[in-house]
């Protein structure tokens, strides 16, 4: 008789999840010499231990503590790039500007990027059928708690000038409910962060508006200023040219505004 299984509203665990995490870990540690000491089997065991046999609506940051410890990685604190709703461009940027880091350029972020996972209470099974949706089911699910945990710690590590890439095509360029707006902004440490610099990425070819004057950007500026961190904002009118100029800064067309 098939056992009754809880049906959640979100997609189930990504197929071949254990193999994917292990393979990503091996690949990352091969490419990054400073992480060669990492035992990927232990990393997988710690990852698994965070959610297997636990109710997928009852996950805590402490569940991920062993994984966080194993994935400890010193990121240059003044080279951190945060992003909100514009992941692909942020990643294209750090692939070119190799000395800057998004969360997904770290081992822990790389392991989990674009994956979904959850288990079931009191069984060692991974649930490939469905996982809790943050809105429809519960917020303390394995995926949401993981990203909240690593995002908080990533923001805590930042110092000096922190950059954030924001999507100027969205109705809310700064969204208080995004991971950036609800977690990272509030965990920048004023004792060591001097400035948050927002890069607002324009979508339209002929969009010459100053999106730094957008009401949601003003809201971000207000939140940041109240935390005793300075705020600055730049429009990136042509993201394609922006990337090209990061690749070839000596190009004569790169002296004009991008």
């Amino acid at each position: 008789v098939p056992r009754w299984r809880q049906q959640w509203s979100g997609p189930g665990t990504t197929k071949r999840f254990p193999e994917t995490v292990l393979a990503r870990c091996v690949k990352y540690t091969e490419i990054h010499p400073e992480m060669r000491h990492v035992d990927c089997q232990s990393v997988w065991d710690a990852f698994k231990g965070a959610f297997i046999s636990k109710h997928p609506c009852n996950i805590t940051e402490e569940d991920y503590q062993p994984l966080m410890k194993l994935g400890t990685q010193t990121v240059p604190c003044n080279k951190i790039l945060l992003w909100s709703r514009i992941k692909d461009l942020a990643h294209q940027f750090t692939q070119v500007q190799r000395d800057m880091f998004t969360l997904e350029d770290t081992l822990l972020g790389y392991l989990a990027d674009d994956l979904t996972w959850c288990g079931e209470f009191n069984t060692s099974k991974i649930n490939y059928q469905s996982c809790p949706d943050w809105r429809k089911d519960c917020s303390n699910n394995p995926v949401s708690v993981f990203w909240k945990t690593v995002s908080r710690r990533f923001a805590e590590a930042a110092c000096d000038v922190v950059h954030v890439m924001l999507n100027g095509s969205r109705s809310k360029i700064f969204d208080k409910n995004s991971t950036f707006g609800s977690v990272e902004v509030h965990n920048l440490q004023p004792e060591k962060v001097q400035t948050l610099e927002a890069w607002v990425i324009h979508g339209g070819r002929e969009d010459s508006r100053d999106l730094c004057q957008d009401p949601t950007i003003k809201e971000l500026e207000s939140i940041i200023s109240k935390r005793n961190i300075q705020f600055s904002c730049k429009n990136i009118y042509r993201p394609d040219k922006f990337l090209q100029c990061v690749k070839n800064p000596e190009d004569s067309s790169c002296t004009s505004e991008i």
Partner: nanobody
């Protein structure tokens, strides 16, 4: 210069108490509160083992062998973590090491302090 310095070790009799302190200094600890602080120990001829830890949110965990006898705490204003050790036993004899860990800042160790429990 990053420095974790343990103090408070010594020779005591079984049943007595000791309080270990771990003081963190250096620019990396400018925001000490975000670090998870832990105490490890290494007994003669044994592997290093976790004794107790306290997260940035002040959640504590203990090794089974010390539960109810040891208490970990922290004073973020003083950049210091403590290990209160009561009802000490001969098997608690070890070098005790302080560890400060933050996922994206680093993993730092002290030099250790000797604790000897003997009658």
């Amino acid at each position: 210069q990053v420095k974790l310095e343990e103090s408070g070790g010594g020779l005591v009799q079984p049943g007595e108490s000791l309080r270990l302190s771990c003081s963190a200094s250096g620019s990396i600890f400018k925001v000490f509160r975000v670090f998870a602080m832990s105490w490890y120990r290494q007994g003669p001829g044994k592997q290093r083992e976790l004794v107790a830890s306290i997260s940035s949110g002040e959640t504590t965990t203990y090794a089974e062998s010390v539960k109810g006898r040891f208490t970990i705490s922290r004073d973020n204003a003083k950049n210091t973590a403590y290990l209160q050790m009561d009802s000490l036993k001969p098997e608690d004899t070890a070098v005790y090491y302080c560890n400060a860990d933050h996922t994206f800042t680093g993993d730092f160790w002290g030099q250790g302090t000797q604790v000897t429990v003997s009658s």
